[in-house]
Interface confidence: low
């Protein structure tokens, strides 16, 4: 059997505060526990949620939590169900509200000698006690023609007279707390001798030089006086008008007429009514001069056929607010249909090509009229004038692929090569008509090309294959001057390509035949052992049937490659002494020596007085300084060969000899001493 160890109990709770309805269950098997409120299951929210078997309230709500809660435990296996005792909250709360008129139904019905009932909309539980105030002064029950009904939160004035006029407020307090009215009620009961408004002047907007009329009437017993003032407090009467209001007329019924209004007449006009008693009533109205500004420009618009589009016309600033309408071909657009005006918008539904043209937005008010045109283009899908064709383009020459289309607006053409977008550079150029120019066709330009022509309405595309007609050429061209090492094996390659595979042969420039130790093997000239006589001019000839022949001239030099006889050594020198770096090379042609120090070539013509390069190639540096330290490279080169070797130079301070050392003591390391 399911047993409740703890049952929920009815309890006091405070609005907006925490609360907990406890429920603990013991049962032989697993049970699931849920809660009911007025018989309906309670859903978990952030505010009210199950906490174990209990129901937790993060903030009690007087409306949502009013009712009877019950804890239900159910064994889903056996179907057994047990319900706890009912529990409810006695929720304590107080909430501010306005002071409202309960009787009569509207302020307009309040007359002297009628009963007036005000209600204090501060509510709470337990029911609060109420205190009423007029103009901040507390009212006690039963004094001066009023009764306070605390239970109904009402203040009744019977009968109400001018002496009851004032600002009514209320406060209430209970065990929960206290609150005062969030909005107060001003009771105004007129004294017959006080001036009352019958007709109040309204703001007017007039065009320059037109007339303006302000109406103003008061009533009282005896009849009140009425006076008009302009901004600077100058009275306006038919006898004494201010200089800038010469054309003003005050009528017997209180109305003020201004004719031929000028900018200086714009401003605030005050109508003042004064009864025999009571304060003057001042009513204000403003005279505005009509004005209208210019309209902003429209950007041209491009729309697609079949779509629905809107163009908004921003009305110009103006007073009064300008009215706006759209025209097309001189005819005002209707407010319904396929092409129509909605508010300030031009609406084109299911756009047709015939809708293209100039539409005009007009704006007008008392001050005048403004207009602005918008050019609407209806986009069409491009159509072909000339598609790209499969083409044979000659290598090295410019090639052209056409993509000629027409549409409204002018279509945009892009080209793709092997599905990759072609961006314009020095080799590719897209002309305004869509034609692609390949400035100097190369072999690898032989592939698929696709052009796409687009407008906002859609696009078309076509592709073409380019075949490159290869020119007869050496690949790569042989170096015009080459060296061979004396007494060694040497090869001189020559290869070429063309539309047909060319045949390649070598010959001496003087026409003589190649000696027997020199062979021409498929374009490679092979010297088994180079002799002095092998030097000279040779020609490589490549030829095929359709393209003829091409020639490349090569001058071969026989040389003894460079070797170093003397190489510079690692050298350490005292500061202020002289350093000598030796270098001597041999070869044929006789090599020249150059030095590089600290990563720059030492130009013999620009060396200072401290440095000198000897005929034999040695480098001498006088009066060495620490900044001369570093790596020095000897470079030997001739027309056939270049070689280099390097050594470091260290510049050190000369040690000061200690007294124990004799004058002939050796230095601590190997030195060049000068």
């Amino acid at each position: 059997a399911i047993v409740f160890i703890k049952q929920p109990s009815s309890q006091d709770a405070l609005q907006g505060r925490r609360a907990l309805l406890r429920c603990e269950v013991e049962a032989p098997g697993p049970v699931h526990v849920y809660w009911l409120l007025d018989g309906a299951p309670v859903q978990d929210t952030e505010r009210r949620f199950a906490q174990g078997s209990s129901l937790s309230f993060a903030a009690v709500d007087r409306l949502q939590d009013s009712g009877t809660f019950q804890c239900v435990a159910r064994d889903d296996v056996t179907g057994e169900e047990a319900r706890s005792a009912n529990a409810s909250f006695n929720i304590k709360w107080i909430e501010a509200g306005p002071v409202v008129l309960k009787h009569p139904a509207s302020e307009a019905e309040i007359q002297p000698q009628t009963q007036v009932t005000l209600r204090c909309h501060i509510d709470g539980h337990p029911r609060p006690t109420y205190q009423w105030f007029r103009d901040g002064t507390p009212l006690s029950d039963g004094q001066s023609n009023h009764t306070v009904s605390s239970k109904e939160r009402n203040l009744t004035l019977r009968p109400a007279g001018p002496e009851h006029s004032g600002l009514y407020s209320c406060c209430a307090h209970s065990a929960f707390g206290q609150a005062c009215s969030s909005q107060n009620f001003t009771l105004s009961i007129a004294d017959e001798s006080f001036a009352r408004v019958v007709l109040a002047p309204q703001d007017v907007v007039v065009a320059r030089y037109e007339e303006a009329m302000f109406h103003c009437q008061f009533s009282a017993q005896p009849p009140p006086s009425l006076q008009w003032l302009f901004e600077d407090e100058t009275p306006i009467t038919n006898r004494s008008r201010p200089p800038h209001l010469r054309r003003a007329t005050v009528f017997a019924n209180g109305s003020l007429l201004l004719t031929q209004v000028r900018p200086r007449n714009a401003g605030i006009y005050r109508c003042i009514g004064q009864g025999q008693r009571g304060p003057p009533i001042i009513l204000e109205a403003t005279l505005h001069l009509a004005e209208i500004e210019d309209m902003p420009l429209f950007e041209p618009r491009v729309f697609t056929a079949g779509s629905e589009e809107r163009v908004t016309c921003l009305p110009p600033k103006g007073l009064p607010e300008p009215s706006v309408w759209w025209e097309h071909a001189g005819v005002r657009l209707p407010t319904h249909g396929r092409v129509y005006q909605k508010g300030h918008e031009l609406v084109l539904a299911n756009i047709a090509e015939s809708d293209a043209g100039v539409y005009t937005c007009h704006a007008a008010n008392l001050a005048g009229q403004r207009r602005q045109d918008v050019n609407i283009t209806v986009a069409t899908v491009p159509s072909w004038l000339k598609k790209p064709q499969d083409s044979q383009l000659e290598e090295g020459k410019p090639g052209y692929l056409d993509c000629l289309t027409q549409a409204t607006p002018k279509p945009t053409v892009v080209w793709y090569r092997n599905q990759m977008l072609i961006s314009e550079d020095s080799r590719f150029e897209v002309f305004k008509n869509g034609t692609l120019r390949i400035n100097s066709v190369e072999v690898y330009d032989g592939t698929w090309y696709r052009c796409m022509s687009s407008t906002p309405a859609g696009s078309i595309e076509a592709q073409a294959r380019v075949q490159v007609l290869e020119k007869l050429k050496f690949t790569p061209p042989p170096q015009p001057q080459q060296c061979m090492e004396f007494d060694k094996e040497a090869t001189v390659p020559c290869s070429a390509t063309g539309r047909e595979k060319p045949t390649i042969k070598w010959e001496r420039a003087d026409g003589s035949s190649l000696p027997e130790w020199v062979t021409d093997n498929a374009g490679t000239l092979h010297f088994a052992r180079v002799t002095r006589d092998d030097a000279g001019n040779y020609t490589c000839i490549a030829s095929n049937g359709p393209q003829g022949q091409i020639r490349a001239h090569v001058q071969l030099t026989v040389a003894v490659f460079i070797t170093f006889k003397v190489e510079p050594e690692r050298t350490t020198v005292y500061q202020g002494h002289t350093a000598l770096l030796q270098c001597e090379a041999q070869g044929d042609p006789k090599p020249l020596i150059q030095w590089k120090g600290k990563d720059r070539i030492l130009d013999p013509t620009k060396l200072g007085p401290r440095m000198h390069i000897f005929q034999n190639g040695s480098l001498v540096i006088h009066d060495v300084a620490p900044e001369d330290s570093g790596r020095y490279t000897c470079i030997a080169g001739n027309s056939c060969n270049i070689k280099h070797t390097e050594a470091p130079l260290y510049v050190v301070d000369k040690p000061v000899p200690e007294e124990s050392e004799g004058p002939g003591s050796p230095p601590p390391y190997k030195m060049i001493q000068t």
């Epitope: 009013s66 309960k102 209600r119 109904e152």
Partner: antibody, heavy 119, light 113 residues
């Protein structure tokens, strides 16, 4: 479970009278304003009258003078006394309770009782 | 006399549709938010959906929502479900000054398209 149960409906002749009762279980009806609402066959809801916690009553303009609402706190019951009944008073009459003692909006409805005025 | 006008009076829609019902009072409510919405099915008592103009009653699905203040109010069903086809009423509290403490809209009948 909180419930409102109306009773006392039935057939009555034009000009006759009827008293409907609204009894609550699970709540103390004296803590709430109680509202009577009616619904003519196939028509919308129409407010009849209200009794506040402090026994003040208000009625729809058409019901003034013919219908009276009262309560018996000891029996947890509110009554609607209907006099000078007419054919157009034929409807299902619902009693309902407000959200709280200060809000007249209806939170809970009874199931309704049918009143038929016919000769 | 206070009049509460619901629009539309009848409305046909499909499951999954978003539905909006409006309620306009001929004068402002007692406190600007004193308005409730109810759902009624044939032969049954009305069921509370929304109170104080925008608060969801306990156990009511979150697809129902309310908004508005003063004299104009809206009930929105964000995605109509088969169980939602019924008649909906707005209900407002007024000052009792002209004898009208409470009033109901004429109802909006929501049917399957």
């Amino acid at each position: 479970e909180v419930q409102l149960v109306e009773s006392g409906g039935g057939l009555v002749q034009p000009g006759g009278s009827l008293r409907l009762s609204c009894t609550a279980s699970g709540i103390d009806l004296s803590n709430y304003a109680v509202i009577w609402v009616r619904q003519a066959p196939g028509k919308g809801l129409e407010w009849v009258g209200i009794i506040y916690t402090y026994d003040t009553t208000y009625y729809a303009n058409w019901a003034k003078g013919r219908f009276t609402i009262s309560r018996d706190t000891s029996k947890n019951t509110v009554y609607l006394q209907m006099n000078s009944l007419r054919a157009e008073d034929t409807a299902v009459y619902f009693c309902a309770r407000s959200f709280s003692d200060i809000s007249d909006l209806i939170k809970l409805w009874g199931q309704g009782t049918l009143v038929t005025v016919s000769s | 006399e206070i009049v509460m006008t619901q629009s539309p009076s009848t409305l046909s829609a499909s499951v999954g549709d978003r539905v909006i019902i409006t309620c306009q009072a001929s004068q402002s409510l007692y406190n600007n938010k004193d308005l409730a919405w109810y759902q009624q099915k044939p032969g049954k008592a009305p069921k509370l959906l929304i109170y104080e103009a925008s608060k969801l009653a306990s156990g009511v699905p979150s697809r129902f929502s309310g908004s508005g203040s003063g004299a104009e109010f809206t009930l929105t069903i964000s995605s109509l479900q088969p169980d939602d086809f019924a008649t909906y009423y707005c209900h407002g509290e007024f000052s009792c000054g002209s004898g009208d403490c409470l009033a109901f809209g004429q109802g909006t009948k929501l049917t399957v398209l």
